[in-house]
Amino acid sequence: WELTILHTNDVHSRLEQTSEDSSKCVNASRCMGGVARLFTKVQQIRRAEPNVLLLDAGDQYQGTIWFTVYKGAEVAHFMNALRYDAMALGNHEFDNGVEGLIEPLLKEAKFPILSANIKAKGPLASQISGLYLPYKVLPVGDEVVGIVGYTSKETPFLSNPGTNLVFEDEITALQPEVDKLKTLNVNKIIALGHSGFEMDKLIAQKVRGVDVVVGGHSNTFLYTGNPPSKEVPAGKYPFIVTSDDGRKVPVVQAYAFGKYLGYLKIEFDERGNVISSHGNPILLNSSIPEDPSIKADINKWRIKLDNYSTQELGKTIVYLDGSSQSCRFRECNMGNLICDAMINNNLRHTDEMFWNHVSMCILNGGGIRSPIDERNNGTITWENLAAVLPFGGTFDLVQLKGSTLKKAFEHSVHRYGQSTGEFLQVGGIHVVYDLSRKPGDRVVKLDVLCTKCRVPSYDPLKMDEVYKVILPNFLANGGDGFQMIKDELLRHDSGDQDINVVSTYISKMKVIYPAVEGRIKFS
């Protein structure tokens, strides 16, 4: 019996087609992805093949103005329209709190939403009961397939699930649910979830009875053969893991942003064992036409976005200096504003010992593309912020050793004075440079804000200590020459859309007046 699994993950509100780098579509003839194009390909496969499941491994939420405006209603509407069969909860599905998941998505979705390792307690338990499930048995042709869901247990540090949801260890939570499916005579089981490729592989290895793992969170691109675009494969598709009980378990992920549709064909024997698995992600490029009915619907939904982008978010009573003459040479107040917003967006008081789990931010000055003049009545709009942060990136959470941070700050000024983009703006960090010293030895003082303290204060950076830092995904991926971050990071979790982080902060503060306050000094 043959099953076709179509899968997406980490779509991050890319409902419209995008450029090849998943930013805003500029030249339509070269654009990719989007739900209208995805639907064309899904329908084509559904017509051609008998047993098809369309699955999503989480993080539909967060990433473009679509999510900012519609807050998840757009996800439910278009996933319903595409007739998804199941979805796993990702960490970003909790970005607007549990209510922001329940009302727009859980109550509106016409497909099961899954996670076996999230347990509700207290008053929330009855409110959320039945709205998401640990597993679902789906009829496919003449057979049944069990889907078990899982979600990153780091979600309380990455999003806003509140205090009434407990995120258990994935493997511990999945095993009894898989066992339950076995007692129900379900012998074909897919683990669908959002914990990253390393955990996907562990689940394949450790959870008895799981036949296939469809994952997300780490934006992993797998491909067999010549890759069709810029993404470099982390391994073959499917990635085969040998389980502890000796089975070959295919593990798949489909990069991110709706650029690819994962396509996996599995052949099962009559006892539900995987006999063979093969496939590849399908690049959703412009050779695949956009479905006209979904496209028409997208265009109707789109009108609110432009209206939103010109509305006032808040006011500034000072000039927000985002000029390259400032931000690539010295501390600039636009950099301070953005870093303060990044830290504020990551406030998670999850432990009495820590005032927060992260206190530091770094931001490449070259990523700040425009100032905002306070003389326009002080008004700040989404449109203004889109000029400051035009690349559609995310502000991510990483874990780095102190020694890596030191290298990053040396890189920040290794060719100082040439208006290059690697000069770092900061938050929760005090750095002093001596430019008379040779490149690679110019950081003379580097103090960082403590987290395990009731009164935050600045302490010298310790080379062997592991620190959490918020930074743009561009830097996490080694951009602007920060190869040491990419090579040495110990953990990387994708965060919220950059503009959304800053706009939320400005809306919260109502009036802002960031200053240049001595975060970066030259001796």
């Epitope: 009915s293 109707k300 009108i303």
Partner: antibody, heavy 118, light 113 residues
Framework: QVQLQQSGAELVKPGASVKISCKAS????????VNWVKQRPGKGLEWIGQ????????NYSGSFKGKATLTADKSSSTAYMQLSSLTSEDSAVYFC???????????WGQGTLVTVSA | DIVMTQSPSSLSVSAGEKVTMSCKSS????????????LAWFQQKPGQPPKLLIY???TRESGVPDRFTGSGSGTDFTLTISSVQAEDLAVYYC?????????FGTGTKLELK
């Protein structure tokens, strides 16, 4: 209130081109799709295409690709449609219509009559 | 392309009469995202642009008298005028609001007997 004011009637020769305008007022022009619709004398309505002034995105009906060119000028809140290589088949009233969240055609211009004659 | 077929092409009625006209689409206009039908009805009087009466197959545009009712689902739709008034004499068009290219029906002309 939403208003769409179209340019006046045009008499043009076969093979020539004509550009008609639709000036919008009473709303944020950049944020709403503007559609164009053709109606030949005594006949039904035909959708030509639409433009999103915010970023210039365009969708054409297949039968008008190469015939109609849609543009928009945000500074003057005006949408334009140019018709090229005109023949008698192009003699018609052309309407612009602004869409809204619930319908493509809730607001209409008064129409522009184009007559193609030697 | 979705083809919209209206019938009858013309109707002769007396004031106060109930009238129904039909619109059939070559494909379903059901929007699976919101379970509504993407169909609109327009009224056009001579020398005027069309006027939106009904959207979503059954929702009256604000200001439209409640004698106008839209119904139907999938591919079969009906516009009913419960008691025709003299000012209702016009051509009525249905429209595929669902997918590109947006298409209009052939029209039903309402005339006085």
């Amino acid at each position: 209130q939403v208003q769409l004011q179209q340019s006046g009637a045009e008499l043009v020769k076969p093979g020539a081109s004509v550009k008609i305008s639709c000036k919008a007022s009473g709303y944020a022009f950049r944020s709403y799709w503007v559609n164009w619709v053709k109606q030949r004398p005594g006949k039904g309505l035909e959708w030509i295409g639409q433009i999103f002034p915010g970023d210039g995105d365009i969708n054409y009906s297949g039968s008008f690709k190469g015939k109609a060119t849609l543009t928009a000028d945000k500074s003057s809140s005006t949408a334009y449609m140019q018709l090229s290589s005109l023949t008698s088949e192009d003699s018609a009233v052309y309407f612009c219509a602004r869409m809204d969240f619930y319908s493509w055609f809730p607001y209409w211009g008064q129409g522009t009559l184009v007559t193609v004659s030697a | 392309d979705i083809v919209m077929t209206q019938s009858p092409s013309s109707l002769s009625v007396s004031a106060g009469e109930k009238v129904t006209m039909s619109c059939k689409s070559s494909q379903s206009l059901l929007n699976s995202g919101n379970q509504k039908n993407d169909l609109a009805w327009f009224q056009q009087k001579p020398g005027q642009p069309p006027k939106l009466l009904i959207y979503g197959a059954s929702t009256r545009e604000s200001g439209v008298p409640d004698r106008f009712t839209g119904s139907g689902s999938g591919t079969d739709f009906t516009l009913t005028i419960s008691s025709v008034q003299a000012e209702d004499l016009a051509v009525y068009y249905c429209q595929n609001d669902h997918s590109y290219p947006l298409t209009f029906g052939t029209g039903t002309k309402l005339e006085l007997k």
